[in-house]
Structure formats: C-alpha cells, structure tokens
C-alpha cells in the first residue's frame, strides 16, 4: 500500500499556503482526485509529488494515491481543507446527472471542518426541500440525496452557518433521469389494411416511453410523412401519436407503412401493408386436397381459408349427398380469425359413418358475391369376401365376391386339409387374379369385384381360399369341399359338419 506524507487523514491549511503531498510506493504511483486547478505533479521513480504554492478553496478535496502495478489495488488517501473564511464551500460541479433510484451526490465540499454542525441543503432562492427528500452529509464529499426521484430534478444550494448567518454555495443543478429500459414501445394500427378505391382509411402510429426525449415518425415506402403529432402523458409514460387520415384512398396510397421511434437506447420500428383494391373480393382456398379419402370410423377436419374484403355477410357448410339429406351439425363447424381479412373455417367430422361419405360444400357471401368450395369425401373400407360354388357353362366354378374401397385385389389359394385359413406349410397352389371383374363402382361407394376359379374336380381333403386385400386391410373366405356337397365359411367361424 502506498504511503502519503504528511501521514495524516486530514490536512487543514489557509489560502495562499504551499501544499506538498508526497506519495511513495514499491513501484510507480499515481495521484488521483477531483479535477482542480493549480496543482503540479512531479514523478520521481517510486514517488510522486502533488504540489501547489498557492492553495485556494478550490483545492479542497480528497486526494488518493494508487499503485497501478499492485494487483491488490491498494491505495492511500488524504483530505485537504483550504479554510477560506469567505468561501465555506468548494463546489466540484454545477450539474449532477444520475438515474432514478441512484444516490445523487451534490459535491459541495466544506472548506472548514469546524462548520459541519451548521450545514443544511436547500433549494435555490431559499426554498425548502421537497417532502420525503432523504439526504445525508459528509464534509469530505458533500450532500447525498438517497434514491433520487425524477421529481427531485431541481437546483440546490449548500448552506453553512458562519458567524450566525447562512452562507450559500453556488447552485448545483440535479438532473434525475428516468431509467430508460430500451427504445420506445410502439403500436401501429391496424396491422394490415385493405380498402376499395374511394373509401376512407386511418393509420395510427403511436410510441411511448418513460422519458420525453424520443422521436417518432411514420413513413410510406421509405418516405417520411409530415403528420401533426399529438402528445400526452398518462400512466407515468409520455405518449406521441401520429394519425394518418385518408378521406378517399387511391392506388398511390397503397404500400408499406412503417412506424419508427428512437431514443438514446436505440430504435424500434414496426410495419404494416396497405392494399387498395378496385372492388370487393372473396377468395376461398384450402391447403388440403379437395378430394379426400378416409377410413371408415376415423375422423376428418375439413379446413377452408377465406380472404375477403369487405367482411363476410354469411357462411355455412352444406352436405350435398349422395347418401342422405342430413346436414352437418353446427356444433361441428368452427370459425377462427387469423387477422382482419383472413379467416379459417373448419368442419369436424368425427368417427365417419358410411352414410357420411359424399360432397361437402363451404359457401360464403360478401358484397363481392357468393363463393363455394366443395370437398369430395370417399370412405375407405377393408374388403369383405364371400365364396360360392356354382356351375358356369357346365364347369364347376368357385365364385369369389370381394367388396371394399379402394378396389381390392384377389388371390386364390389351394391347401391340404380342412382349415379356416391356409398357412404357408399347407399351401399347394396359388393363383393371382390381376383383373377381377368389377361388378359395381359408384362414386363414394364400395367397389365390388368378382373372381372366378374353375375347378375340374374338387379335392375333398383340401381347402380353397379366396383372399382379398387393399390399402385398408384384407379379408378372406375358405371353401371346404365335403362329400355331402360343398361347404363354405369365412375365417374364424366354427366349422360344423353334420
């Protein structure tokens, strides 16, 4: 730690005195203190001399000596009083700037320690301090206003009693700045705007901040607009509002509008787009395919996006058949507004039944007219299979009918033994029918196909199986010839032979 000579915490001298403060350390040392005139500094290796041969009240202050090379940052200090009967105060600065809730030190230093008992802080022209002003005094440093508030931004004077009369310091202006957390908060209303040519429009750009020092402007396609500004103060915030009123919009008013506000912390901007159209419009679209296929028993949400101006005057979902005249339940229809001009309408179809396949249409109306968007819903079914024995053109034939959607394809299997379903070990022969005959194929219905297997002689200890499958599932039917005739049964059924 450096050592100061004279080795006293405080030194009291008279104006005009010569003052020499010497600091000695292990390495190089540096003096620091309040900036004040008339000092001279001399360095001499590991010592530094701070001196004046004509001390004035302005040299009153605390002088600190540090050793820059000391990792512990040790320092020594001495406080100098230059006791001037005419000048009880040395004011280090005439303006103090702090942020709200910081302590504000008003640096009026007492030039004579004896005067400490009679000091006080006042506002200029002898006005008392504001209520709730919490302050303390240090003869070395001055008056501290604790947790300063914006409202305490005033001009202050330090007062000392000398010979029964109050002697004032020069004034100190305290500026308490509001803590600005960032750039001003912004709103630009509306977020999007559409108007038909000739209609009126309004765009409002507003910014607010805890500090009045901020700028706000509205620009159209990078051109700053000259708009009168309205200012207000509420909820402890300053507000500046720019309102653009357009009585009859035209195409040149369209484009990008940006609301920009800036302060010392930076800049905020937000933008909106203004569209001017020739006439009303109504556009329906869907992100989904308009042709939908869903497995029976499952659910489906049909979604329609609507873009419209002016707003919708009516809308509904309609079932167009072909199975029944039922209409979608209103509780299954849902509307959500994405923004002013875009909406999403959803029809929920849970646990779809066969009778609910068909066409669903969404209709909407605005001053631009009616529009409709139609979905075609086909249900998928796993195949259902049946086999019969018959004679066609005198030949014994197994006839397999398979019904499902999408169209099933058919495979015949011949296997040894009597079984509900042929397994690999039993299979004797396999026939694929690549082109079964389509018996019925109507929109929104199952597709029924028929496959024929001509069998010259039925082997009695064997099973003939028709298998059908599609993307949903598979079905099969086993045919077992019996001496008394023929017996067919679907899989998993108990085979009863009387």
């Amino acid at each position: 730690i450096p050592v100061i000579e004279p080795s006293v915490p405080e030194l009291v001298v008279k104006p005009g005195a010569t003052v020499t403060l010497r600091c000695v350390g292990n390495g190089s040392v540096e003096w620091d203190g309040p900036p004040s005139p008339h000092w001279t500094l001399y360095s001499d290796g590991s010592s530094s001399i701070l001196s004046t041969n004509n001390a004035t009240f302005q040299n009153t202050g605390t002088y600190r000596c540090t050793e820059p090379g000391d990792p512990l940052g040790g320092s020594a200090a001495i406080h100098l009083y230059v006791k001037d009967p005419a000048r009880p105060w040395n004011v280090l600065a005439q303006e103090v700037v702090v942020f709200e809730d910081q302590d504000a030190l008003l640096p009026c230093l007492l030039t004579d320690p004896v005067l400490e008992a009679g000091v006080s802080l006042v506002r200029v022209r002898g006005r008392p301090l504001m209520r709730h002003t919490n302050y303390s005094f240090s003869p070395w440093h001055g008056f501290t206003i604790h947790r300063a508030k914006f409202i305490q931004s005033q001009d202050y004077q330090c007062s000392a009693l000398m010979g029964g009369r109050k002697v004032m310091s020069i004034s100190i202006r305290l500026k308490v700045q509001k803590v600005i957390p960032g750039p001003p908060a912004l709103t630009l209303v509306p977020a999007e705007l559409v108007r038909i040519r000739g209609e009126a429009a309004q765009i409002v750009c507003s910014a607010s901040s805890v500090d009045v020092n901020f700028d706000v402007f509205l620009q159209h396609n990078n051109t700053k607009l000259a708009i009168p500004q309205q200012s207000d103060f509420h909820n402890n915030r300053y507000q500046k509002v720019l309102t653009l009123n357009l009585d009859q919009v035209d195409f040149q008013h369209a484009g990008n509008y940006s609301c920009v506000a800036s302060n010392v912390q930076g800049k905020h901007s937000t933008s909106m787009f203004f569209r001017v159209v020739e006439s009303a419009y109504l556009n329906l679209s869907s992100e989904q395919n308009l042709i939908q296929e869903v497995t029976v028993g499952e659910g489906l949400n049909l979604k329609v996006m609507v873009e419209a101006y002016p707003g919708l005057q009516g809308f509904n979902w309609t079932y167009l058949g072909p199975f029944s005249d039922h209409q979608p339940e209103p509780k299954l229809a849902n509307a959500t507004t994405k923004d002013t001009y875009r909406h999403t309408f959803t029809l929920s179809l849970p646990r779809l039944k066969p009778s609910e396949a068909g066409r669903y249409s969404f209709l909407a109306r605005n001053p631009g007219g009616w529009r409709a968007l139609t979905f075609e819903l086909t249900l998928r079914y796993p195949p259902e299979v049946s086999v019969i024995w018959t004679f066609i053109n005198g030949s014994g034939t197994l006839l397999c009918a398979a019904s499902g959607y999408p169209q099933p394809n058919v495979t015949w299997l011949q296997c040894s033994g009597h079984t509900d379903r042929c397994d690999e070990a039993q299979v004797l022969q396999v026939w694929d029918d690549p082109y079964p005959e389509v018996l019925s194929q109507e929109p929104f219905h199952k597709v029924t196909v028929q496959s024929l297997l001509t069998v010259e002689t039925l082997e009695h200890n064997q099973t003939y199986e028709c298998r059908a499958h599609n993307s949903v599932g598979s079905g099969s039917w086993a045919f077992i010839p019996i001496s008394a005739g023929a017996h067919t049964h679907p899989p998993d059924e108990f085979l009863f032979t009387p």
Partner: antibody
Framework: QVQLQESGPGLVKPSETLSLTCTVS????????WNWIRQPPGKGLEWIGY???????NYNPSLKSRVTISVDTSKNQFSLKLSSVTAADTAVYYC???????????WGQGTMVTVSS | QSVLTQPPSASGTPGQRVTISCSGS????????VNWYQRVPGTAPKLLIY???QRPSGVPDRFSGSKSGTSASLAISGLQSEDEADYYC???????????FGGGTKLTVL
C-alpha cells in the same frame, strides 16, 4: 490495461440529438474523471466536458446549453448527448480519461459523426 | 480562434531539435499546468507531456516540456520520421472554467 471504446450512430440529422456512449474496460469508472473531446474535420481539438464518477459534470461554456454527460457505473459506461445539432457539430468524437491536473492520459480511438439530412 | 496560440506548422530534418511554442494568458497557462498531446494522422491523440514537464511512462526522453509565465514549449530532440504528427497544447482556463486547447502544430520531418 484500461481501454475506451466509443459507440453510437455515425449519421445524425440536423436539429436531432447526437448520442454517444463510451465503454471503459480493464479498469473501474469509479475513479478519475471522464471526458468527451471532439475534432471537426481540418480543425483542432475541442473539449466538450467531463463527468466525475459521482455524476458531477463540467461543460465547455460554448456548448453548455446543449450538452448532457451522464455515467452508469454499473455498466462502466458514460454517455454524451448533444441536442439541436447542426453541420458544425460534424466531427470525430473522442472519449478520454482525465487526471487531476486536467491531463487526458487514455483516449478512445474516436468515432466520426456526420450531421446531415 | 483557439484560446491558446500555436504556430500552424513546424519542420525539421532527422536528428535535429525542434521547438513548438504555446502562448496563453494569466487565466490559463499563467496559473495552471500545461499538457501536450501528439496526434498521428488516423489515430487517437496521445498524452506526451503533463504538468508542464512530466513525461508519462513509455514516452521517449527526446520529448521535453517547459513553462514560463504565460507561455509553454515542447522540444523534440533527435527528430525521427515517426515524430511527424500534429501537436496540441492544453491547459485549464480559470475564467472560462474549462479545458482549452491550442490550434495545433503540424510537424513535418523533411
């Protein structure tokens, strides 16, 4: 060692407020005093003002009505605000550390501010 | 117009000694200490001399300062090409209550 770095917009419009910040690194702002100095193109240095870490300030009388210098000890930064700027305020702006004999021993590298519409 | 007066230019050949003067008044140089700064083009100013005649560490002893009455001077001996720069004097002014600078002297090494 102590280093100073100025930051702020390089272009300011006439009549607006010029705002600069000086960040002190490698040492504490809570000793010494901290200055702003500028140099207009082709001219000499001009002292703008200083702030002592306690928040007390002293400004060049010719600029006093337009200048505010503030300090944020928690961020180790001090700032300059110069209001109602004109083209005459176009300059390289420096921040510098001051010693008690008014010697500026450490300087930032400077930032050029142009006042133009 | 600067409060402190310096010659706008000075020159010398390598190895020569060059002196730059700074003239003030009783409210600045007459009652306060003088500091000198060197500014090489494109860089920030650097403290060269403080408190009339004190050199900060790292400044070569070729640079020296002096003060007499209301004038001060900066002397550079053994001039080198890297000394080509602008030099400014500065002091506190009691009546203006602020720091004042000289107009600067451009030193050219021939």
């Amino acid at each position: 060692q102590v280093q100073l770095q100025e930051s702020g917009p390089g272009l300011v419009k006439p009549s607006e407020t010029l705002s600069l910040t000086c960040t002190v690194s490698g040492g504490s702002i809570s000793i010494y005093y901290w200055n702003w100095i500028r140099q207009p193109p082709g001219k000499g240095l001009e002292w703008i003002g200083y702030i002592y870490y306690i928040g007390s300030t002293n400004y060049n009388p010719s600029l006093k009505s337009r200048v505010t210098i503030s300090v944020d000890t928690s961020k180790n930064q001090f700032s300059l605000k110069l209001s109602s700027v004109t083209a005459a305020d176009t300059a390289v702006y420096y921040c510098a550390r001051g010693r008690l004999t008014y010697a500026f021993d450490i300087w930032g590298q400077g930032t050029m501010v142009t006042v133009s519409s | 117009q600067s409060v402190l007066t310096q010659p706008p230019s000075a020159s010398g050949t390598p190895g020569q000694r060059v002196t730059i003067s700074c003239s003030g008044s009783s409210s600045n140089i007459g009652s306060n200490t003088v500091n000198w700064y060197q500014r090489v083009p494109g860089t920030a100013p650097k403290l060269l001399i403080y408190s009339n005649d004190q050199r900060p560490s790292g400044v070569p002893d070729r640079f020296s300062g002096s003060k007499s009455g209301t004038s001060a001077s900066l002397a550079i001996s053994g001039l080198q090409s890297e000394d080509e720069a602008d030099y400014y004097c500065a002091a506190w002014d009691d009546s203006l209550n602020g720091v004042v600078f000289g107009g600067g002297t451009k030193l050219t090494v021939l």
